[in-house]
């Protein structure tokens, strides 16, 4: 359409409204050194940025909270970044057999919205 | 068991970490009072509070952006509280043919996490 | 671009061991591990086994254990599976394929016939 | 093992056509799916990955979607150099298993 909807266009400018973007992590950052064996280094996805009124509401919850949030800003907390969904990622662990893959659903965030 | 688990006991004290909330709100609040005709005045529940280090954690995703928040607080956002679960809610509405039940399954928080 | 090089063709005696390269292009081979993948003719994929090309870590398929091993050669970028006591069970074509956490099996190399026949 | 059915092994089409081939899993794999085209002779070319993720360079008449235990990969407006066997595979859980493929013939 001709104008960009509400949900999609930022009014705070570039890369400042809720979305993915890649955090570099090592096995030694998240505490799994021990037990995971490789990647040594993990690329993770994660949602970032704020959420101004119904910029990616994720539903009709989202929707009031925003609105509520103007209302009584000090009573109802804005919508905030969450992941919407996530992408499978496998990881190679120690087991007591030997060496395992091992697939986490709801490790990496695959989008985001205002929650 | 004897000690609470931290995702479960709040460090912040009593109603400062995530919890589900009533929140009292009009048709006029919610801009529907032109469609909804009942009922006028909603209890909505929301999910509301801070979300200190593993509280809650909705998943893999929320335990991991917890822990690199710790490391890097600039560029990881902690973890935000948000349903995990909705109860759906009928509402009365005007139709072109006269008036309507119909039901919205995410509009009231039945339960919240921290994600 | 992303090349994976494999023999064509290797022809074996039962009982015999043979070791098969898969020469890798186009990309920092450490960053990806090296899966093998066997297709007997007529039916279909089965997964073998996979090695971090970095570290040498290795994960196989119970079924393929004592059968396959995996290693990897840095300096060449070249990936290798050896299979021991040949059968003519092992008959078939052996495709190595990039791997990595997200990506699953994104390149195959185009595989190596194994004819095991006396 | 986690076994992948691909219950056709074979389906017609004519150019143009939209197309669905399917794949159940025998237990949950959430979104742990990944789709490949074989043609005779050559290796296999991922598709999808993900359940619906499409890989750099793959046409996007090509879509993939489902969760949990059933899976399709649709073909929209199907192209002579679309025929040829198509895979399903799961990653869900060591070892690795793919489908049985299904062949796509002309009518």
């Known amino acids: 359409s001709a104008h960009a909807h509400p949900r999609d266009s930022c009014p705070l400018g570039p890369g400042r409204c809720c979305h993915l973007e890649t955090v570099q992590a090592t096995l030694e950052d998240l505490g799994w050194s021990d037990w995971v064996l490789s990647p040594r280094q993990l690329q993770l996805s994660m949602c970032v940025g704020e959420c101004p009124h119904l910029y990616r509401s994720a539903n009709t919850h989202a929707q009031i909270k925003a609105r509520l949030h103007g209302l009584q800003p000090d009573k109802v907390p804005a919508p905030c970044c969450v992941p919407s969904s996530y992408t499978p990622v496998v990881l190679m662990h120690r087991t007591d057999s030997g060496v395992s893959l091992q697939t986490y659903d709801d490790l990496v965030a695959r989008g985001c919205h205002c929650a | 068991s004897a000690h609470a688990h931290p995702r479960d006991s709040c460090p912040l004290g009593p109603g400062r970490c995530c919890h589900l909330e009533t929140v009292q709100a009009t048709l006029e609040d919610l801009g529907w009072s032109d469609w909804v005709l009942s009922p006028r005045q909603l209890q909505l529940s929301m999910c509301v509070g801070e979300c200190p280090h593993l509280y809650r954690s909705a998943n893999t995703h929320a335990q991991i952006k917890a822990r690199l928040h710790g490391l890097q607080p600039d560029k990881v956002p902690a973890p935000c509280c948000v349903p995990s679960s909705y109860t759906p809610v009928v509402l009365m509405h005007r139709t072109d043919s006269g008036v309507s039940l119909q039901t919205y399954d995410d509009l009231v928080a039945r339960g919240c996490h921290c994600a | 671009q992303v090349q994976l090089q494999q023999p064509g063709a290797e022809l074996v005696m039962p009982g015999a061991s043979v070791k098969m390269s898969c020469k890798a292009s186009?990309?920092?081979?450490?960053?990806?591990?090296m899966h093998w993948v066997k297709q007997r003719p007529g039916q279909g994929l089965e997964w073998i086994g996979v090695i971090d090309t970095s570290e040498s870590y290795t994960s196989y398929n119970q079924k393929f254990k004592g059968k396959a091993t995996l290693t990897v050669d840095e300096s060449s970028s070249t990936a290798y599976m050896q299979l021991s006591s040949l059968t003519s069970e092992d008959s078939a074509v052996y495709f190595c394929a990039r791997g990595g956490t997200t990506v699953v099996l994104d390149y195959w190399g185009q595989g190596t016939t194994l004819t095991v026949s006396s | 093992d986690i076994v992948m059915t691909q219950s056709q092994k074979f389906m017609s089409t004519s150019v143009g056509d939209r197309v669905s081939v399917t794949c159940k899993a025998s237990q949950n794999v959430g979104t742990a799916v990944a789709w490949y085209q074989k043609k005779p002779g050559q290796s296999p070319k991922a598709l999808i990955y993900s359940a619906s993720t499409r890989y750099t360079g793959v046409p996007d008449r090509f879509t993939g979607s489902g969760s949990g235990t059933d899976f399709t990969l649709t073909i929209s407006n199907v192209q002579s150099e679309d025929l040829a066997e198509y895979f399903c595979q799961q990653y869900s859980s060591s070892p690795w298993t793919f489908g049985g493929g299904t062949k796509l013939e002309l009518k």
């Open positions: 186009g990309y920092t081979f450490t960053d990806y591990w």
